[in-house]
Interface confidence: medium
């Protein structure tokens, strides 16, 4: 920002500066460019020999300047325009100045003033420029001080020159008040704080409703002597509840908010939430939905999901794998675990009882993130209950459950678990095991065989021990094994079908199960 | 009253030289810029050449150049143009006009350089 | 050089009548136009100098306007002694230029 204490051009020839000597050298004229008036001091005495003409403006109050800049707009004619050479004629003029407290009026006395420079044009104007009418003008800047009285005059000295000063313009350079980063700059005097510190540090004031970081710096900008802002350090955010518009914080419209001092904006109070208020730092839940502790403020608030859709329970012998489908209801949340519990009842005394400790499941039963899961080590006559409860992040927040339950009655004994032992090119040993709980119920064991790809015959072997071995077979060849159980009650579960083969005659090969 | 009187036209054949003159009056010739115009029949205004107040600088059209040379004697008030190697084209109307020159001592010129005053004019003719 | 285009080249007119005629050029040249009437057989005579201004002893049906590169004249009331061609002429640089002319006739 440029603060202005004098501009010639400005005043329209009102500005009535004081030449000596009176009446001869400087004097005010208008002329039009541009189809504008504009006035000049001009002087043009370059046929009569040496020149001491002195223009001096009026007083000029220093206000708080310590530098100020000095702008001179001017005309300079080229001596070899004249008829005749004019022997006498210089190019350039010299410009001083003088500070006082007071005012001396017309009291002018050249030894007051020092001298600043000599200004020379970087142009002159030469005949067919000054015939054409195209007015070469020279713009030269100086500064000066730093000044320490009240105020100052300028004076301009003619040596001999044909000259026009169009415009004088003396100004001193401020810091302009600024808003950057949301703090507040005051205006600042351009000054050298020293000669190897030229930038003066200001500290900045955050604007309304504006804070600084936690854990960062504080505004500062660096002032420099041509009033120039450098380097911003630090900033301010707009504090929760306000966002940034422009320069300043704006309080978050009714149905918005910000939960945090920060650059962005405010946010759309998310689903299922209740409309806010003006400057909201958060938007509450709707009556029925919630936010989990680790939830952000925008996200939309959610609920607990509705119960597992179609819960069915296969039985497999001793063992009963649970399907089931996604809640038709997640409740608008994508973190749904499922738990299974189970219930044993006996069917003669109508007993019943958790049954976690005594059964075994495929995965841990709580925490499912499938939607399946196998239990196994059934016992036979009984019947079980199984629940599966559907829950998400929020479902901790209610104390109702969201569960659906299947039964099933254990009739069969597991099916028994079958390994090859060992085998050799005309035979295979066969082992297998039930669990404990369940052999007392076991009368004997039924294994059947045949060749693979022969389906017109098989072969059947009984067996009270876990293990059998199958002889007479043929070398290097795919036997199909199955082991079934026999109960009291008739046929337990069969086994799964195994592919066992005997070793070729040229021997070694790997045992394949 | 301000005058402008030209003289010197005539017929000449191409490749020949005329010298016209413009004798001034009623105003001071020594502070006028002067200038002259050409016309050829039934065409329009063509800038032939000017001269500053004192002699200097001189300026000419790019169809002249060189073949004209423009000059003045402001202790006779007469403005003259040597014409040479003189062409058909060339034929026409040759008008003297003069403006305010401004030529003062003044740091920045005041009056503008339009054609104020114009003689009567003169023809020239080349033919052979 | 700076060219000047001037439209129309002639023009029929009648007495009264408001006439316009315009003046381009071929880059800007502020207000450094003249223009000029000029009568068969006679010598032109300045009408409008620095675009606008009114020569001394012209009548003041007579006006110039414009600045850059158009320009106009205008007589707001076409008198008998107004017949004549008319030419304008900018002096931005040395080597000043005419327009060709516009011719006007009487209806």
């Known amino acids: 920002k440029e603060v202005v204490l004098l501009d010639f051009a400005a005043m329209k020839g009102e500005l009535g500066w004081l030449t000596h000597p009176y009446g001869k050298g400087w004097d005010l004229m208008q002329n039009i460019m541009d189809d504008m008036p504009i006035y000049m001091y001009s002087v043009c005495n370059v046929v009569s020999g040496d020149q001491d003409n002195w223009l001096r403006t009026n007083w000029v109050y220093r206000e708080e300047a310590e530098r100020i800049f000095i702008e001179l707009k001017f005309t300079v004619r080229d001596c070899n325009s004249f008829p005749g050479g004019a022997s006498s004629c210089k190019e350039t003029f010299n410009l001083y100045y003088a500070e006082s407290d007071v005012d001396y009026g017309t009291n002018f006395q050249k030894r007051q003033f020092t001298k600043i420079d000599t200004i020379a044009p970087d142009e002159i104007t030469v005949s067919s420029d000054f015939e054409a009418r195209n007015v070469k003008l020279n713009v030269e800047e100086r500064m000066v001080g730093p000044l320490t009285r009240k105020g100052f005059y300028l004076a301009f000295q003619d040596i001999g020159a044909c000259v026009a000063l169009l415009s004088v313009r003396v100004y001193y350079k401020k810091c302009p008040e600024m808003l950057q980063s949301l703090a507040r700059f005051p205006e600042t005097i351009a000054v050298a704080v020293s000669d190897t510190q030229p930038l003066a540090t200001v500290a900045g004031t955050c604007v309304d409703h504006a804070v600084v970081p936690y854990g960062g710096e504080g505004p500062l900008m660096h002032c420099t002597v041509d009033g120039e802002w450098l380097v911003p350090i630090g900033q301010c955010l707009c504090q929760e509840g306000y966002e940034k518009v422009e320069d300043a914080c704006r309080a978050c419209s009714p149905g918005f908010f910000k939960s945090e001092a920060s650059e962005s904006p405010c946010l759309e109070c998310p689903e299922h939430t209740l409309p806010s208020t003006e400057g909201a730092t958060s938007c509450q839940c709707e009556e029925g939905y919630f936010r989990a502790p680790e939830d952000p403020l925008s996200m939309s608030c959610t609920r607990p999901p509705s119960a597992p859709n179609y819960l069915t329970a296969i039985g497999m012998g001793a063992k009963v794998e649970l399907r089931w489908t996604a809640p038709k209801d997640t409740g608008g949340r994508q973190d749904i675990v499922y738990s299974v519990t189970c219930e044993q009842c006996w069917p003669e005394s109508g007993e019943c009882g958790p049954c976690e400790a005594s059964v075994r499941y495929s995965e841990p039963p709580h925490a499912l993130t499938r939607t399946s899961v196998t239990v196994s080590d059934l016992e036979p006559h009984m019947n079980y209950t199984f629940a599966v409860e559907a829950r998400n992040g929020v479902s901790g927040l209610v104390t109702s459950r969201s569960f659906r339950t299947a039964s099933v009655s254990i009739n069969q004994t597991e099916p028994p678990k079958v390994r090859l032992e060992d085998r050799s090119t005309t035979s295979l040993s066969v082992t297998w095991s039930i669990p404990v709980s369940q052999q007392s119920r076991v009368w004997k064991y039924e294994v059947t065989y045949r060749k693979k790809g022969d389906a017109n015959s098989y072969n059947v072997r009984r067996t009270e021990g876990f293990s059998v071995t199958l002889d007479d077979l043929a070398p290097d060849t795919t036997y199909l094994v199955q082991v079934q159980a026999l109960t009291q009650e008739g046929q337990g579960a069969g086994s799964k079908v195994h592919e066992f083969q005997t070793l070729s005659t040229e021997g070694s090969a790997n045992m394949a199960v | 009253e301000v005058q402008l009187l030209e003289s010197g036209g005539g017929l000449v054949q191409p490749g020949g030289s005329l010298r016209l003159s413009c004798a001034a009056s009623g105003f001071t010739f020594s502070h006028y810029m002067m200038a002259w115009v050409r016309q050829a029949p039934g065409k329009g205004l063509e800038w032939v050449s000017r001269i500053g107040p004192s002699g200097g600088p001189t300026h000419y059209a790019d169809s002249v150049k060189g073949r004209f040379t423009i000059s003045r004697d402001n202790s006779k008030n007469t403005l003259y143009l040597q014409m040479n190697s003189l062409r058909a084209e060339d034929t026409a109307v040759y008008y003297c006009a003069g403006y305010d020159s401004g030529y003062d001592y003044v740091a920045v010129a005041g009056p503008a350089e339009y054609f104020q005053h114009w003689g009567q004019g003169t023809l020239v003719t080349v033919s052979s | 050089d700076i060219q000047m285009t001037q439209s129309p080249s002639s023009l029929s007119a009648s007495v009264g009548d408001r006439v316009t005629i315009t003046c381009r050029a071929s880059?800007?040249?502020?207000?450094?136009l003249a223009w000029y009437q000029q009568k068969p057989g006679k010598a032109p005579k300045l009408l409008i100098y620095?675009?606008?201004n009114l020569h001394t002893g012209v009548p003041s049906r007579f006006s110039g306007s414009g600045s850059g590169t158009e320009f106009s004249l205008t007589i707001s009331g076409l008198q008998p002694d107004d017949f004549a061609t008319y030419y304008c002429q900018q002096y931005n640089v040395y080597s000043r230029t005419f327009g060709q002319g516009t011719k006007v006739e009487i209806k």
């Open positions: 880059q800007s040249i502020s207000t450094w």
């Open positions: 620095k675009a606008s």
